[in-house]
């Protein structure tokens, strides 16, 4: 699977999660967050070559239309596939709030 | 929707579908496929600015910092959102087969 | 170009044998189904005897009317399909065209070769 | 097996004509939208040759006057301006479970 177990372990031109580190204010200047401070999200990113997790038939067949079509521009593209939520803290006024904002780090990637 | 009736009628540079016919037999290599000859795959392509039909909080996330870190590679990638299956006929010997292959045309896409 | 050239048509006695050649190019043989289909004088034409490729286990098929007499088989190395005919019989007189079948339709037909059985 | 009876045996007709065969299978010939039926041509001396195939599909190198159309059981054949060089036996064939089998074929000769 090319999760974080595998991914940060290997140095992994295709495919891959790759660690991000975003700050929320200097990142996003998402002043309202007050915890944590940023977070790993990770992204994902490099080639995908035929048939490396393979999201669907048509990612299938598209990696195999680029292997043999090397100039064509349409092929696959390293998205997310496992994420997790994370929990954050913030104030409305000066009442303390805790949320779990779904989808917001990747653990691992597919070509789709 | 970022879906063939919109991206099939305007000239979209961002994320959108856009068609592409594959040949089974010239395209794939795929002699086994008998009929069609060939489907429109399509393929999703186009920069995925920050917000444009995010899939995830995670590529919402990853839309805003790379909007504020234009220098970061990290970004949403524009891929398949809806697809749809494909009825193929084949011969297994001397007996006719057909199957639908599923998840075969792109019909619409996302940031992910 | 697609070419199936037949060879091994003659003359010959009732209860003789007779083996057609059938050698094939301008396709990939290894990957298709070989046929033999006959017309005999005033008739139409009838499969006589097919077999697949090594995919599918080199399947034969015969007519009912050639079972137990007839063989077919190939070499992919030759790129050629045979017709073994034993105990002939006047009515197996006629003209043998080897063809290709790629999918369901008979795409490609050698020119024929000629059988005549008789005393 | 699937028994295929063509009408007419034979016909008589002049260049110009518009001439329709028919197919008939004693069972469906058709899976799923795909129809398993295919037409020849045969000329004396020469080698048959693939006109039509999976119904209505014109085969490589055949003039668009030849179109074929049916599905199930019935199919038809039909040369909508008929040429000096279509005289000739037509017969169906189709593929739809083995063994594949030939129809008695259609003689168009001149009038």
């Known amino acids: 699977a090319l999760d974080t177990n595998y991914c940060f372990r290997n140095l992994e031109e295709n495919c891959c999660v790759r660690p991000l580190y975003i700050d929320f204010r200097q990142d996003l200047g998402w002043k309202w967050v007050h915890e944590p401070k940023g977070y790993y999200a990770n992204f994902c990113s490099g080639p995908c070559p035929y048939l490396r997790s393979a999201d669907t038939t048509h990612s299938t067949v598209l990696g195999l239309y680029n292997t043999l079509n090397p100039e064509a521009s349409a092929s696959p593209c390293c998205v997310p596939q496992d994420l997790e939520p994370l929990t954050i803290l913030y104030y409305v006024g000066r009442t303390p709030k805790v949320e779990q904002l779904s989808n917001m780090v990747v653990k691992s990637c597919k070509c789709s | 929707a970022l879906d063939t009736n919109y991206c099939f009628r305007n000239l979209e540079e961002n994320c959108c579908v856009r068609p592409l016919y594959i040949d089974f037999r010239q395209d794939l290599g795929w002699k086994w496929v008998h009929e069609p000859k060939g489907y429109y795959a399509n393929f999703c392509s186009g920069p995925c600015p920050y917000l444009r039909s995010a899939d995830t909080t995670h590529s919402t996330v990853l839309g805003l910092y790379n909007t504020l870190n234009p220098e970061a590679s990290a970004s949403p990638c524009c891929v398949p959102q809806d697809l749809e299956p494909l009825t193929i006929l084949y011969y297994v010997g001397r007996t006719p087969k057909v199957e639908q292959l599923s998840n075969m045309v792109v019909k619409s896409c996302k940031c992910s | 170009e697609v070419q199936l050239l037949e060879s091994g048509g003659g003359l010959v006695q009732p209860g003789g044998s007779l083996r057609l050649s059938c050698a094939a190019s301008g396709f990939d043989f290894n990957s298709y189904g070989m046929s033999w289909v006959r017309q005999a004088p005033g008739k139409g034409l009838e499969l006589v005897a097919d077999?697949?490729?090594?995919?599918?286990?080199?399947?034969?098929y015969y007519s009912d009317s050639v079972k137990d007499r007839f063989t077919i088989s190939r070499d992919d190395s030759k790129s050629t399909v045979y017709l073994q005919m034993n105990s002939l019989r006047a009515e197996d007189t006629a003209v043998y065209y080897c063809?290709?079948?790629?999918?369901?339709?008979?795409?490609?037909w050698g020119q024929g070769t000629l059988v005549t059985v008789s005393s | 097996d699937i028994q295929l009876t063509q009408s007419p045996s034979s016909l008589s007709a002049s260049v110009g004509d518009r001439v329709t065969i028919t197919c008939r299978a004693s069972?469906?010939?058709?899976?799923?939208?795909?129809?398993?039926m295919h037409w020849y041509q045969h000329k004396p001396g020469k080698q048959p040759k693939l006109l039509i195939y999976r119904a209505s599909n014109l085969a490589s190198g055949i003039p668009s006057r030849f179109s074929g159309s049916g599905s199930g059981t019935d199919f038809t054949l039909t040369i909508s301006s008929l040429q000096p060089e279509d005289f000739a036996t037509y017969y169906c064939?189709?593929?739809?479970?083995?063994?594949?089998?030939f129809g008695g074929g259609t003689k168009v000769e001149i009038k």
């Open positions: 077999i697949v490729s090594k995919t599918y286990n080199y399947t034969t």
């Open positions: 069972q469906s010939v058709s899976i799923s939208r795909f129809n398993l």
């Open positions: 064939q189709h593929s739809r479970e083995s063994p594949w089998t």
């Open positions: 063809t290709v079948a790629p999918g369901g339709s008979f795409d490609y």
